[in-house]
């Protein structure tokens, strides 16, 4: 509900300064406040605009100050406006100057349908004149010279809402800067009766509080609060839920109060008279000092709060017994909170006696909207009331106010929130390389819209044409590998960025789409690499049996061990062999292979030759004859690599006798470099040469190493070994 | 928490009297006008009495005029309703409630009365 | 008297749909000086009190959930479930409190289909 409150410093204007200050308590109005003059009320009066500014001391609130010297230019009708979702409220007050001829009893007067009522003015002046009374700036009434009493009344027997208006007071040679104006509401309803037809029956509205005639809620007059104006507020504070607070030195004293109508205006609490300059006399409290106190049991009566009940004692005159009751206090509220646009709960928290209830909890949006708990809970101190807003987006950012209205009081907190967009990624991430199991991604997620700074990110990604849920991972890099992916399967993926606070998760951005790779064949078996002459090699496998209808074809890679010279072959997957040629002669290569489809297959081990050789192999090295004995010794010896050398020739013959009486052996694996001659002659020296040969020819042996057996008795003499061929 | 706890339902004949009560907590019970309304079974609600928060102005149904009298004990927070003359068509549910503006914001748990021979 | 009449009667709606309960008064219960409805819309569940869900034709109870709204003026007005759940099976009265006596629809039973 909207809380407009008026206040009239100083409504009889002398020379010193006076103000209107209009003050929107609690809500935020949707256009500004409005303060004007009332020509409805007084169509003669000054005609100037008035020079309205922002109340530095209050958030919502417009101000009119009139410096002393234009005190004559005062004198009317003054209504202040506010509007909030469509609704507007006008609050109407009067300002005079105290020199008149006559002055009002109060500056406006609340009366039921059908009251009897009378209108009262006093004579501060004496003239020899005729009085006159204007309703609404038209004559209604006069009386003779000699006949104005100290009081000048106005009768109205039968009041009906007609009868409502600003009637005013003056001598005949007067004018309206001499003229006193009170202002009568009439009630469209009788006594403690409200609605459309003023048929159903009011609430009471305790201390001096006024009963809506078409809300049946209860006006609280300044200093009172609650559903039935039954609580009073602390010491110098006013509105709806007392949150207001008068700055002056004494409190509110010098301000009157126009609330809207049918209340209109008074003192706060405590004060009385025209100007609310003086103070309640002992025993009355309330508004105007209206309201007497009656304490039960000899209480202490403030002027302010009336019975001040002692403990285990309410009730206006402290005749209830019970628990005190405690104004609500709002706790646990921030007064700022930032929020994640989508689903929030924003929890009112509030203590008292008696505790709130979940109707009695509620939650004003900026525009306005009132919202009720969604969920309510109490402890034995505080209630708990939890709202829902289903989906909270950046214009609902600013003022929000958390209202308690209780029996025992009312209280408001605003606080500010602040919504923020959820981030969420431009652009799609990128794939920078996959493979039949692996994806590296590059999450791209910056730039992004919406709020941050950013959290956590998450990668998604899911097979696309699977009903399965979205995986994601946590990343941290811009760079990030995906594991243990199917092959050959399309996946989808995006990236969803995390603000701070609940509900922080922004929406997946842009969706990429990419492929694995088909899982690797294994490579060919039985590989076998041979040279087949000095400038090729033939390479081997067995039949290749693919178990998918793909293509398929065997890549073969063969480099040079001495030379940075690499090539890769594309062989048909029917074949079983490859030649490999335009190489160097006496040169060592390595060769592997694989299978491929569409995707590359396992690569072979590497296989290892050497093209045949263009020259005569070189002699063996490191000859030597160990192990001698009666009968045998062994020979060893070392060759060089890279000459294609197929065999190893040992040529002996006994010393003296001719060369066609040698004896060759020779040994077709180039791999064994050690051999045991046997069969030989007890003590006899023999001539032995080794040679090696390959597809040229045979070494040239520069000089023969000889041999002699030792007698039979004579153990042998280990001289080392190698491999050895026996 | 506001309640209203009623008692005083039952059976009696036809043309004999019942008083029901309607005691109140929780609530400033003397600043608030107080209704009773009744559900006769299987139907509808239907409007019976309501009396001002001070007891001075009381209204009622024109199906229960002249029969039936609303009051209430503000020093004990009760709200009574006395009814004489029952007939038939008084069997209901009779239900004590607070108002919120004309709304009927709190009710009592409900009291049985049957009126029958 | 100014009279209330509900349609339908009875109403069945699956779980999870929209249900709409219509309210037609006899006369009008917008009161133009501060353009507000006067009427009030109640579920009531069996052996149990009726229960305030909304008031001025459209300002939802404290407490009461927000799949319920208010809409209307003058002589029509609608309250609507906008997603039914099964805790919302009850008897549903509108009330007009524009005059005395306060008058009640004969009320809508809504079930699940």
């Known amino acids: 509900a909207m809380d407009l409150i008026l206040i009239n410093s100083l409504p009889l204007v002398s020379d010193a300064e006076t103000s209107l200050t209009c003050i929107a308590s609690g809500w935020r109005p949707h256009e500004p406040i409005t303060i004007g003059r009332d020509f409805e009320a007084l169509m003669n009066q000054h005609q100037d605009p008035l020079e309205v500014t922002q109340d530095v001391t209050r958030e919502w609130a417009k101000k009119v100050v009139w410096k002393r010297e234009k005190a004559s230019k005062i004198n009317g009708a003054y209504f202040c406006e506010g509007r909030v979702r469509g609704e507007a409220i006008r609050i109407r007050t009067m300002k005079m100057r105290q020199q008149a001829s006559f002055l009002p009893a109060t500056l406006t007067m609340t009366v039921d349908k059908g009251d009897n009522v009378n209108i009262s003015f006093k004579k501060v002046l004496i003239k020899e004149e005729d009085a006159v009374i204007y309703k609404n700036g038209s004559f209604i009434h006069s009386v003779p010279r000699h006949e104005v009493p100290d009081i000048l009344e106005v009768h109205l027997p039968h009041a009906q809402p007609q009868d409502a208006g600003v009637y005013s007071a003056r001598y005949i040679g007067g004018n309206l800067f001499t003229s006193a104006f009170t202002r009568l509401i009439v009630r469209r309803c009788e006594a403690q009766k409200w609605g459309p037809e003023c048929n159903h029956l009011c609430t009471a509205c305790m201390n001096n509080g006024v009963c809506h005639e078409d809300t049946g809620e209860c006006i609280c007059p300044p200093g009172f609060m609650g559903r039935t104006c039954e609580k009073a507020c602390e010491l110098h504070t006013f509105g709806r839920t007392c949150k207001e607070r008068c700055s002056g030195q004494e409190g509110c004293k010098s301000y009157v109060f126009c609330l809207p109508d049918p209340y209109g205006c008074s003192c706060a609490t405590g004060w009385k008279g025209l100007q609310c300059n003086e103070a309640c006399h002992p025993g009355f409290y309330g508004p105007d000092c209206k309201l007497r106190c009656s304490c039960n049991n000899g209480e202490m009566c403030d002027r302010f709060q009336g019975c001040l009940c002692s403990p285990g004692w309410q009730g206006l005159q402290c005749e209830r017994e019970g628990i005190p009751r405690m104004t609500p206090k709002i706790v646990d509220l921030p007064d700022h909170i930032e929020v994640n646009s989508g689903k929030f709960n924003p929890i009112c928290k509030a203590s008292g006696w008696p505790l709130p209830t979940n109707e009695e909890m509620t939650l004003v949006k900026p525009d306005g909207t009132v919202l009720h708990p969604k969920d309510f809970n109490h402890t034995d101190h505080f209630s708990v009331a939890i709202f829902t807003i289903h989906r909270i987006l950046p214009p609902d950012s600013g003022v929000w106010v958390c209202s308690v209205n209780t029996v025992a009081g009312m209280v408001e907190k605003p606080f500010n929130i602040s919504v923020k967009v959820l981030p969420k990624p431009l652009n799609a991430p990128n794939v920078i390389d996959t493979g039949h199991n692996f994806a590296v991604i590059n999450i791209s997620s910056e730039p992004y819209f919406g709020d941050g700074p950013i959290k956590s990110k998450k990668l998604l990604y899911k097979p696309v044409n699977h009903y399965e849920a979205w995986q994601h991972i946590q990343v941290t890099n811009e760079i990030v590998t995906l594991n243990y992916l199917e092959p050959r399967t399309e996946y989808e993926l995006c990236v969803q960025l995390v603000r701070r606070g609940e509900g922080g998760e922004g929406h997946p951005g842009p969706v990429r789409r990419f492929t694995t790779a088909s899982i690797g064949l294994p490579p060919p078996r039985g590989l076998n690499l041979l040279p087949k002459s000095q400038t090729t090699l033939n390479l081997t496998w067995q039949p290749i049996f693919p178990s998918s209808e793909d293509d398929f074809y065997v890549e073969v890679e063969r480099r040079s061990v001495q030379k940075s010279d690499q090539q890769n072959i594309k062989v048909p997957g029917n074949l079983t062999s490859v030649l490999l040629n335009n190489l160097h002669p006496r040169e060592q290569y390595v060769v592997r292979a694989r299978v491929n489809t569409k995707a590359q297959g396992e690569w072979s081990e590497d296989l290892t030759a050497w093209t045949l050789s263009d020259i005569l192999p070189p002699q063996p090295e490191n000859i030597k004859i160990s192990n001698i004995t009666h009968s045998s010794a062994v020979i060893s010896w070392t060759i060089l690599d890279g000459y294609s050398i197929s065999s190893i020739t040992i040529r002996y013959k006994v010393q003296g006798k001719n060369e066609d009486q040698h004896v060759d052996v020779k040994i077709k694996n180039a791999t064994i470099t050690q051999y045991q001659l046997k069969g030989l002659e007890p003590e006899t020296a023999y001539q032995v040469d080794i040679f090696a040969e390959n597809n040229i020819g045979s070494s040239n042996p520069a000089f023969s190493h000889e041999l002699v057996t030792l007698p039979e008795s004579q153990a042998p003499a280990d001289l080392g070994g190698g491999k050895m061929l026996l | 928490q506001v309640q209203l706890v009623q008692s005083g339902g039952g059976v009696v004949q036809p043309g004999r009297s019942l008083r029901l009560s309607c005691a109140a907590s929780g609530l400033t019970f003397s600043n608030y006008a107080m209704h009773w309304v009744r559900q006769a079974p299987g139907k509808g609600l239907e409007w019976v009495a309501v009396?001002?928060?001070?007891?001075?102005?009381?209204y009622y149904a024109d199906s229960v005029k002249g029969r039936f009298t609303i009051s209430r004990d503000n020093s004990k927070n009760m709200l009574q309703l006395q009814m004489n003359r029952l007939r038939s068509e008084d069997t209901a549910v009779y239900y004590c409630a607070t108002p919120k503006g004309g709304a009927l914001e709190i009710w009592g748990q409900g009291t049985v009365i049957t009126v029958s021979s | 008297d100014i009279q209330m009449t509900q349609s339908p009667d009875s109403l069945a709606v699956s779980l999870g749909e929209r249900a709409t309960i219509n309210c037609k008064s006899s006369q009008s219960a917008l009161y133009s000086s501060n353009n507000k409805n006067y009427l009030a819309w109640y579920q009531q569940k069996p052996g149990q009190p009726p229960n305030l869900l909304m008031y001025?034709?459209?300002t939802r109870e404290s407490g009461v959930p927000d799949r319920f709204s208010g809409s209307g003026s003058g002589t029509d007005f609608t309250l609507t479930i906008s997603s039914l759940q099964a805790e919302d099976v009850a008897v549903y009265y509108c009330?007009?409190?524009?005059?005395?006596?306060?008058?009640f629809g004969q009320g809508t039973r809504l079930e699940i289909k």
């Open positions: 001025w034709a459209s």
């Open positions: 009330q007009q409190y524009y005059s005395a006596p306060i008058t």
């Open positions: 009396i001002s928060y001070d007891g001075e102005n009381k």
